[in-house]
C-alpha cells in the first residue's frame, strides 16, 4: 500500500535511515509531503516484522522503489495511486 497523507501534524520522524529494505519485507509505505507543520517530506515504512522506520527521502533505493510503484499502479489501477486524506 502506498499512501500520501496531508496532515496538519508536526513532523513524525525524529530520525531517518538510508538502509535498504527489500520490498518483500515491506508491508506499507506512507508519504507525508512537506508543509502543514513539517518543513520536510517524510517517508514512513512499516515492515512485515512489526517494526516501523522513517526512510530518508533522498535515499536512492526508496526513490527507485517509489517510481516503480507509481508506474505499476498507474498502469494497473483506474484510480490514482496516491490517497489524499485531509482531516
Amino acid at each position: 500500500v502506498l499512501e500520501v497523507y496531508y496532515t496538519s501534524l508536526r513532523c513524525r520522524c525524529v530520525q531517518e535511515s538510508s538502509v535498504f529494505i527489500p520490498r518483500r519485507f515491506i508491508d506499507r509505505i506512507q508519504i507525508l509531503p512537506r508543509g502543514n507543520g513539517c518543513p520536510r517530506k517524510e517517508i514512513i515504512v512499516w515492515k512485515k516484522n512489526k517494526s516501523i522506520v522513517c526512510v530518508d527521502p533522498q535515499a536512492e533505493w526508496i526513490q527507485r522503489m517509489m517510481e516503480v510503484l507509481r508506474k505499476r499502479s498507474s498502469s494497473t489501477l483506474p484510480v490514482p495511486v496516491f490517497k489524499r486524506k485531509i482531516p
Partner: antibody, heavy 122, light 107 residues
Framework: QVTLKESGPEILQPSQTLSLTCTFS??????????VGWIRQPSGKGLEWLAN???????YYNPSLINRLTISKDTSNNQAFLKITNVDTTDSATYYC??????????????WGQGVMVTVSS | DIQMTQSPSSMSASLGDRVTITCQAS??????LIWFQQKPGKSPRPLIY???NLANGVPSRFSGRRSESNYSLTISSLESEDMADYHC?????????FGAGTKLELK
C-alpha cells in the same frame, strides 16, 4: 483515555498453568498497527518482555519462554490473554499488560496496566 | 538476543545533584531505545524515546544521549519526585530486551 487492567490468580502451584487476562479500553485491537503485549517483573528485579500480539494476529514471543507461552486476543471484547504452562517459583512476578501502536514516533509500551502480582508456591 | 547492560544497579544522590545512568547495547540498536521511569508501587512510564527525545509531560531536567553503543539518561538537577527505578529498553529487534534497572535513592 487508554486503560488496561490485568486479572488472574494471585497464587498457584508449581506445574500448573497461569492464565492471565488483559481488559482494555480507549483503543481497539482492530486498526492497523495496534498491538498488546505482556511484560513481567519479579519482586525487586528488572523487567522482562514476554510476548506481543498484533491487530492481524501476528504473535511474537520471548525465545527463552516460547515453549511455555501462548498469547491470544478477543478483539470484539477488547481483551488479550496470556497462558504460561508448567509454572515454577521463578515465574512469581508482577505481570503487566502493555499497549504498542506502530505509529511514528514509535514508542512501544506507551500504556501500561497496573499489574497483577502472581505467586507460585507449593 | 541483544543484551542491555545497565549501570549502576543502584545509586544514592542528593537533591540538586546531576545524575547519569547508562545502558550499553551488545550490538548496534541505532537509537531504538526507550528510558522508562517506575515510581515505587507504580507501573513504568516512557520518559525518553529514540534515545534523546522527551516524552510528553517529562520535565526538561531529563535528557538522553548516545555515544556509540552507550546510551545515557541524565537528570540535571535531582528533585525528590525523581526517586524511582529507571529501565532502558531496546526495540531494534525481537526479543525486545530491558536493562536490569537502576534504583535511584535519596542520600
Amino acid at each position: 483515555q487508554v486503560t488496561l487492567k490485568e486479572s488472574g490468580p494471585e497464587i498457584l502451584q508449581p506445574s500448573q498453568t497461569l492464565s492471565l487476562t488483559c481488559t482494555f479500553s480507549g483503543f481497539s485491537l482492530s486498526p492497523y498497527g495496534m498491538g498488546v503485549g505482556w511484560i513481567r517483573q519479579p519482586s525487586g528485579k528488572g523487567l522482562e518482555w514476554l510476548a506481543n500480539i498484533w491487530w492481524d494476529d501476528d504473535k511474537y514471543y520471548n525465545p527463552s519462554l516460547i515453549n511455555r507461552l501462548t498469547i491470544s486476543k478477543d478483539t470484539s471484547n477488547n481483551q488479550a490473554f496470556l497462558k504460561i504452562t508448567n509454572v515454577d517459583t521463578t515465574d512469581s512476578a508482577t505481570y503487566y499488560c502493555v499497549r504498542s501502536e506502530l505509529v511514528m514516533p514509535y514508542v512501544p509500551f506507551d500504556y501500561w496496566g497496573q499489574g497483577v502480582m502472581v505467586t507460585v508456591s507449593s | 538476543d541483544i543484551q542491555m547492560t545497565q549501570s549502576p544497579s543502584s545509586m544514592s544522590a542528593s537533591l540538586g545533584d546531576r545524575v547519569t545512568i547508562t545502558c550499553q547495547a551488545s550490538q548496534d540498536i541505532e537509537n531504538d531505545l526507550i528510558w522508562f521511569q517506575q515510581k515505587p508501587g507504580k507501573s513504568p512510564r516512557p520518559l525518553i524515546y529514540y534515545a534523546t527525545n522527551l516524552a510528553n509531560g517529562v520535565p526538561s531536567r531529563f535528557s538522553g544521549r548516545r555515544s556509540e553503543s552507550n546510551y545515557s539518561l541524565t537528570i540535571s538537577s535531582l528533585e525528590s519526585e525523581d526517586m524511582a527505578d529507571y529501565h532502558c529498553l531496546q526495540f531494534k529487534q525481537y526479543p525486545y530486551t530491558f536493562g536490569a534497572g537502576t534504583k535511584l535513592e535519596l542520600k
